[in-house]
Amino acid sequence: NQDLPVIKCVLINHKNNDSSVGKSSSYPMVSESPEDLGCALRPQSSGTVYEAAAVEVDVSASITLQVLVDAPGNISCLWVFKHSSLNCQPHFDLQNRGVVSMVILKMTETQAGEYLLFIQSEATNYTILFTVSIRNTLLYTLRRPYFRKMENQDALVCISESVPEPIVEWVLCDSQGESCKEESPAVVKKEEKVLHELFGTDIRCCARNELGRECTRLFTIDLNQTPQTTLPQLFLKVGEPLWIRCKAVHVNHGFGLTWELENKALEEGNYFEMSTYSTNRTMIRILFAFVSSVARNDTGYYTCSSSKHPSQSALVTIVEKGFINATNSSEDYEIDQYEEFCFSVRFKAYPQIRCTWTFSRKSFPCEQKGLDNGYSISKFCNHKHQPGEYIFHAENDDAQFTKMFTLNIRRKPQVLAEASASQASCFSDGYPLPSWTWKKCSDKSPNCTEEITEGVWNRKANRKVFGQWVSSSTLNMSEAIKGFLVKCCAYNSLGTSCETILLNSPGPFPFIQDNIS
């Protein structure tokens, strides 16, 4: 049919370029290159119906369904989704093609389904059908990588049993301490499963797929390093493989390394050695202790000894199930607006946790730092002095942990007033929670010093606003005060704030605001 327009249907995926998680804001949004959805004519359908290729979208992803129409003249359009019509505003691109878009922000189950686009051009009418579904990630898994020795070779294989198939990479660093962070120039990455260079200072293997990234560090005892003040501890679950690397450097080759478990030499087949000369002609030896599948009786002190270095040990603990150990009692803090403060949680966990800090339904990235004593710590400082409840949530394959914090910000009260026919009410934030006084202003008391005590009802912390407690005080109207100005004052240790109200007829009449320091 010559009258049929040339139609192109595309899908644009958006990456939310935002450091915080759980934001409804689409700003700033970065777009991926458009993906062609085909848009073929649907055979045996009444009317002209184009069908786009099915679209699978991740939960919370943001997308645009877009149609480009190469047809003369103006076009009008209408989107229909689940029997509701949605506004449609076509525009024209530089090639003078009609462009119609449907933006779906933060994909949810309710936004999945058939999107019908009805287009009317000067020449003809036609329909375009998009089917949008949520990608089934229930079957997806991302497992922490583990190590295996390569058959007949002195090399390690990194394995992660994950769906979809993960990309595996080795992350190597020859520096000490913090400079082995991912973005450091000292870090080298190798996107391969097998690693032959096993002499480095810090060796990790990472696996990543659509669900994220998981890493496992090769546990190492370095006999040339001063031992930690507390014994290093390695946790494993029953059935997991154990790998410990002992490393030593000496001026010549005249030294040997051995592994012992609880003073008994490891059996043949549970260790292997490698050695090399370094650039300055010193000898580096490494001795691996490994158990392909640990049992409870593999628990104990593993000691690496050298004929030329002091020996060092690590405690290996085999557990049936993962754990997160930390105190979950809630903690309350109060600070001034001008002082800095960080929440912190100290915990011991295996396997490594995933964690978030949450405030007011907004989640923030969570950083963890390992301490020398086997504990880890997570700090959150970016509260921007907003009072309320902060939640630390951590989980791993076997355990969950939640800890609540309350942050109170010391500040002078600020009063809001409202009045009705029968009463006047004042509300105040501020911390510590304020106390209230009501005063009547009259000829006798032009400075509003006459205190009102009858008919006053105070409610402390009756509702939470953005995590802030609000205190209120209500004055029931009596004949004695009708027509007068009254003043409600909230005061705490940081100051006083007042609001003056005229009590005559219904309606809100905050009249004058006095702020008394």
Partner: antibody, heavy 116, light 111 residues
């Protein structure tokens, strides 16, 4: 990648005012405090003040009160520092910095030269 | 305001040796168990770079030869072994309370 991009150098007359900008990329400024710091030639660093762009609450070092005014525009992900009644004492490099968990990210600085 | 006194004002150290810079606060910079003392490095024509935060935590991509220590009011930055690239100005800074204050700076050079 987190970046703070500051506006270019300014040459201004005494008594005038100047407005410097600091545009965030790779993060949303609403989620962080944005601070401004002054550094006079060959001298140390002085904290001017900060803004919470989410609610426009500002805090200043008293010695910059009246001299500096910090604002933010969340739609363009940009913070601003306005300096008024400029004198030669205001000749300096002005930095913006983002505070989340400490002062990790800084802008490249804007040199303001006050000269007749 | 919390006043930070940094010493020495300038320091020359041989390559491979240890450089130690001290910073004393006029009052404690501790709050609920965290000391809000940070260290910055600044090279000519560049903006300051966070080296150490909260006394002893290394900033992103900072080499392990930079370490911090101290508590309460007395803090120090150690650089060992000293390298060519470490020639710069170093500032301590407290973020315990507003106004945030900086030390006067230490100019570190190669001997």
């Amino acid at each position: 990648e987190v970046q703070l991009q500051q506006s270019g150098a300014e040459l201004v007359r005494p008594g005038a005012l100047v407005k410097l900008s600091c545009k965030g990329s790779g993060f949303n400024i609403k989620d962080y405090y944005i601070h401004w710091v002054k550094q006079r030639p060959e001298q140390g660093l002085e904290w001017i003040g900060r803004i919470d762009p989410e609610n426009d609450i500002t805090m200043y070092d008293p010695k910059f009160q009246g001299k500096a005014s910090i604002t933010a525009d969340t739609s363009s992900n940009t913070a601003y520092l306005q300096l008024s009644s400029l004198t030669s004492e205001d000749t300096a490099v002005y930095y913006c910095a983002r505070n989340g968990n400490f002062f990790a990210y800084w802008g490249q600085g804007t040199l303001v030269t006050v000269s007749a | 305001d919390i006043v930070l006194t940094q010493s020495p004002a300038s320091l020359a150290v041989s390559l491979g040796q240890r450089a130690t810079i001290s910073c004393r606060a006029s009052e404690s910079v501790d709050n609920y168990g965290i000391s809000f003392m940070n260290w910055f490095q600044q090279k000519p024509g560049q903006s300051p770079k966070l080296l150490i935060y909260a006394v002893s935590n290394q900033g992103s991509g900072v080499p392990a030869r930079f370490s911090g220590s101290g508590s309460g009011t007395d803090f120090s930055l150690n650089i060992h072994p000293m390298e060519e690239d470490d020639t710069a100005m170093y500032f301590c800074q407290q973020s315990k309370e507003v106004p945030w204050t900086f030390g006067g700076g230490t100019k570190l050079e190669i001997k």
